[in-house]
Amino acid sequence: ELCDDDPPKITHATFKAVAYKEGTMLNCECKRGFRRIKSGSPYMLCTGNSSHSSWDNQCQCTSSAARNTTKQVTPQPEEQKERKTTEMQSQMQLADQVSLPGHCREPPPWENEATERIYHFVVGQTVYYQCVQGYRALHRGPAESVCKMTHGKTRWTQPQLICTGETEPSQFPGEEEPQASPDGLPESETSRLVTTTDFRIQTEVAATMETFIFTTEYQ
């Protein structure tokens, strides 16, 4: 069942899902100058059986100008070898994700993907909060929010997190202290995806690394 509202906004904090429950939908959005192919699905869908979950459908973007050229979501096996090293850093977040039954991992980027990812979460999904760089977490309890359903209405639990103006960024569950990365940003800022539902996620490619920096742009 889809969560029909958004995870709570916490001042000076972002959130992400470590894994996505089956039923989660990801919009197939293309960057400016590209559009989803006409026959393409508007969403990727986390589906699975008892033993394995994966993203269904392939997001495909084509140039708005060109009629016949299409860009596929995930590379073919032979292409994967060529792209493996360049994508390694941008997908580091996949390496430490636990394979939870009934959950999908963060889907890899696709060619000409939009500069935001819009997820539609389902009941039972947990998202984890972290203070943005330059702020320190004061925990009163778990820095997480869960989508629950009561009387047919969905709601997210309130994360017990306050971010205060200090220098050390807090970590998502299970993460170690970040090592300095080549461009001076903490690793948690450069190689991990912060995910959301309606909040737009801005992606920027770091100048010195083939890595995505995700920050939430609250509206």
């Epitope: 069942e1 029909d4 958004d6 039923g23 939908m25 969403y43 539609h120 209405k153 737009r200 509206q219």
Partner: antibody, heavy 116, light 106 residues
Framework: QVQLVQSGAEVKKPGSSVKVSCKAS????????MHWVRQAPGQGLEWMGY????????EYNQKFKDKATITADESTNTAYMELSSLRSEDTAVYYC?????????WGQGTLVTVSS | DIQMTQSPSTLSASVGDRVTITCSAS?????MHWYQQKPGKAPKLLIY???DLASGVPARFSGSGSGTEFTLTISSLQPDDFATYYC?????????FGQGTKVEVK
């Protein structure tokens, strides 16, 4: 008590546009998404899309993506749906419905008739 | 898109009858919700999350099912129950409704 009050019936010419309003009261407008549902004469219900009034984010049924534009005005607690390039097949009753899960409150509906 | 198929499309019944409406989803869904609509009126929430009665709905209404097959039952049809009933899924976008089942006087 929660109320959704929609604007009155409209008769429009083919090719024109119409903007239907839905004024909410009795609850915090920004706490719930507002959905829109269409019902053509003698037909069933079709979900068109929703708006999150607090962020302005919209999600559409692909069938209506080029037809409908959903907006909201926090200051007046009102959601709007504009229909463009009207054709006779757009003749229908349009409902707003409060989200946040199942549609527990609905507007009374707005009949839009497209006729030359 | 998940297609919702209701049967029957029209059901002729008398007061006191036990009435059953079925709704079949083209893919597995988490829950089914049901709405009642009377002519010229907006739909009204009847049953949510497959089997929970909405506020003010009489106990003669019940819902059941799982996966792709769901049922709405009226144990003893009352004069106020003659209406059109719609099943609805909100497990995936686009949200979809069944085509409706009209319960009319026999």
């Amino acid at each position: 008590q929660v109320q959704l009050v929609q604007s009155g019936a409209e008769v429009k010419k083919p090719g024109s546009s119409v903007k239907v309003s839905c004024k909410a009261s009795g609850y915090t407008f920004t706490s719930y998404r507002m959905h829109w549902v269409r019902q053509a004469p003698g037909q069933g219900l079709e979900w068109m899309g929703y708006i999150n009034p607090s962020s302005g984010y919209t999600e559409y049924n692909q069938k209506f993506k080029d037809k409908a534009t959903i907006t909201a005005d926090e200051s007046t607690n009102t959601a709007y749906m504009e229909l463009s390039s009207l054709r006779s097949e757009d003749t229908a009753v349009y409902y707003c419905a409060r989200g946040g899960g199942v549609f527990d409150y609905w507007g009374q509906g707005t009949l839009v008739t497209v006729s030359s | 898109d998940i297609q919702m198929t209701q049967s029957p499309s029209t059901l002729s019944a008398s007061v006191g009858d036990r009435v059953t409406i079925t709704c079949s989803a083209s893919s597995k869904i988490s829950y089914m919700h049901w709405y009642q609509q009377k002519p010229g009126k907006a739909p009204k929430l009847l049953i949510y999350t497959t089997s929970d009665l909405a506020s003010g709905v009489p106990a003669r209404f019940s819902g059941s099912g799982s996966g792709t097959e769901f049922t709405l039952t009226i144990s003893s049809l009352q004069p106020d129950d003659f209406a059109t009933y719609y099943c609805h899924q909100r497990s995936t976008y686009p949200l979809t409704f069944g085509q409706g089942t009209k319960v009319e006087v026999k």
